[in-house]
Amino acid sequence: FVRTKIDTTENLLNTEVHSSPAQRWSMQVPPEVSAEAGDAAVLPCTFTHPHRHYDGPLTAIWRAGEPYAGPQVFRCAAARGSELCQTALSLHGRFRLLGNPRRNDLSLRVERLALADDRRYFCRVEFAGDVHDRYESRHGVRLHVTAAPRIVNISVLPSPAHAFRALCTAEGEPPPALAWSGPALGNSLAAVRSPREGHGHLVTAELPALTHDGRYTCTAANSLGRSEASVYLFRFHGASGAST
């Protein structure tokens, strides 16, 4: 089968399938949709197709990550003549079709957003009646999930030569700036973005040498808010006790 896309500001949502001149395959998705973690987001997707008056069975599909090969997060099927698209798959029950595929609308609602939902999504429609054809948005819509900082781990670890170091890891989008404060410290901004694959929202800051006993506080901040957590270092008989 053959397919293309268009990048246009024209509103094709209400274009009739049987309008003249004949429609060609196209899908309209915005490059990006932004929403905050915990909220819901709508991923718009409308399409046109060349099969006039098509009323046969159809399937609407959304994938994440990659077109064609990416995992499906939503799938529904509508029987011949039906405007009801029965959900067959909704990952974690958080995906719901808002649009009506019979009216060329595959728009999807995603509930209870998490930072892990920050990826590209691709809509697809399949016709399976007298006409066998399918079309997928190859460029997709990027769902950009924002989140206030959250410190996911703070700890004190032994270092060589009976020393100690502190680690603070936080998540957020935009990635938060981390700062340490504590005894005999100013503010240390020794934050480095975690290099681990798939952890792009995690930031880690290390205090390489804790020279004084007391309370060490890690503060994470971005444009949406701030968060802080503390560890306590007490050295006695060469051992350390740390609590948050």
Partner: antibody
Framework: QVQLVESGGGLVQPGGSLRLSCAAS????????MTWVRQAPGKGLEWVSF????????YYADSVKGRFTISRDNSKNTLYLQMNSLRAEDTAVYYC???????????WGQGTLVTVSS | DIELTQPPSVSVAPGQTARISCSGD??????ASWYQQKPGQAPVLVIY???KRPSGIPERFSGSNSGNTATLTISGTQAEDEADYYC?????????FGGGTKLTVL
């Protein structure tokens, strides 16, 4: 400004290998599918291969399938084409191009010449 | 696989209208794009989605697609428009170009 610059072309013997590079600048490389298109001397354009944003989806023309491998390094803003088992009919100027959201090629490099000859 | 067919050559007098056709069954359902290529240079996109013009392309370039034939029209052709023109389309896994048309401005 938006720019693509190919390199790595040259003279190679039949059966040999060559790796082409395409350095991208002036745009967010990881937001675009990329492609290689070639043009034999005095002939028309022939699409060679596509690669998706992350590199995990690739497509090839039948004429190069199994011999050529497209890849990308988004951290270096660079597209690659590894060409193995080269044949005389692979002689061409190889262009890298950016694919716009309408499945058209909106930015092209200047091309690099690959000559396969003994 | 899809195939796109173009005439090898088209001639036009300066100031006149040049029309270059591209035919193929795929064009009944899918968009065409057009590329201009001058000797020794890389191709340049002049039309996409049948009739859309990228920024920087003169208004004298226009496109249409009817039935199984896409047409590139150059109104008021100028000497600098002399070039090879290629149509293109896409089938989900491969992109195909027509054989190219050499436009000669007499």
């Amino acid at each position: 400004q938006v720019q693509l610059v190919e390199s790595g072309g040259g003279l190679v013997q039949p059966g040999g290998s060559l790796r082409l590079s395409c350095a991208a600048s002036g745009f967010t490389f990881s937001n675009y599918w990329m492609t290689w298109v070639r043009q034999a001397p005095g002939k028309g354009l022939e699409w060679v291969s596509f690669i998706s944003y992350s590199g995990s989806t690739t497509y090839y023309a039948d004429s190069v399938k199994g011999r050529f491998t497209i890849s990308r390094d988004n951290s270096k803003n660079t597209l690659y084409l590894q060409m193995n088992s080269l044949r005389a009919e692979d002689t061409a100027v190889y262009y890298c191009a950016r694919e716009g959201t309408s499945s058209m090629f909106d930015v092209w490099g200047q091309g690099t010449l690959v000559t396969v000859s003994s | 696989d899809i195939e796109l067919t173009q005439p090898p050559s088209v001639s036009v007098a300066p100031g006149q209208t040049a029309r270059i056709s591209c035919s193929g069954d795929a064009l009944r359902s899918y968009y065409a794009s057009w590329y201009q290529q001058k000797p020794g240079q890389a191709p340049v996109l002049v039309i996409y989605d049948d009739n859309k013009r990228p920024s920087g392309i003169p208004e004298r370039f226009s496109g249409s697609n009817s039935g199984n034939t896409a047409t590139l029209t150059i109104s008021g052709t100028q000497a600098e428009d002399e070039a090879d023109y290629y149509c293109g389309s896409y089938d989900g896994t491969v992109h195909v170009f027509g054989g190219g048309t050499k436009l000669t401005v007499l």
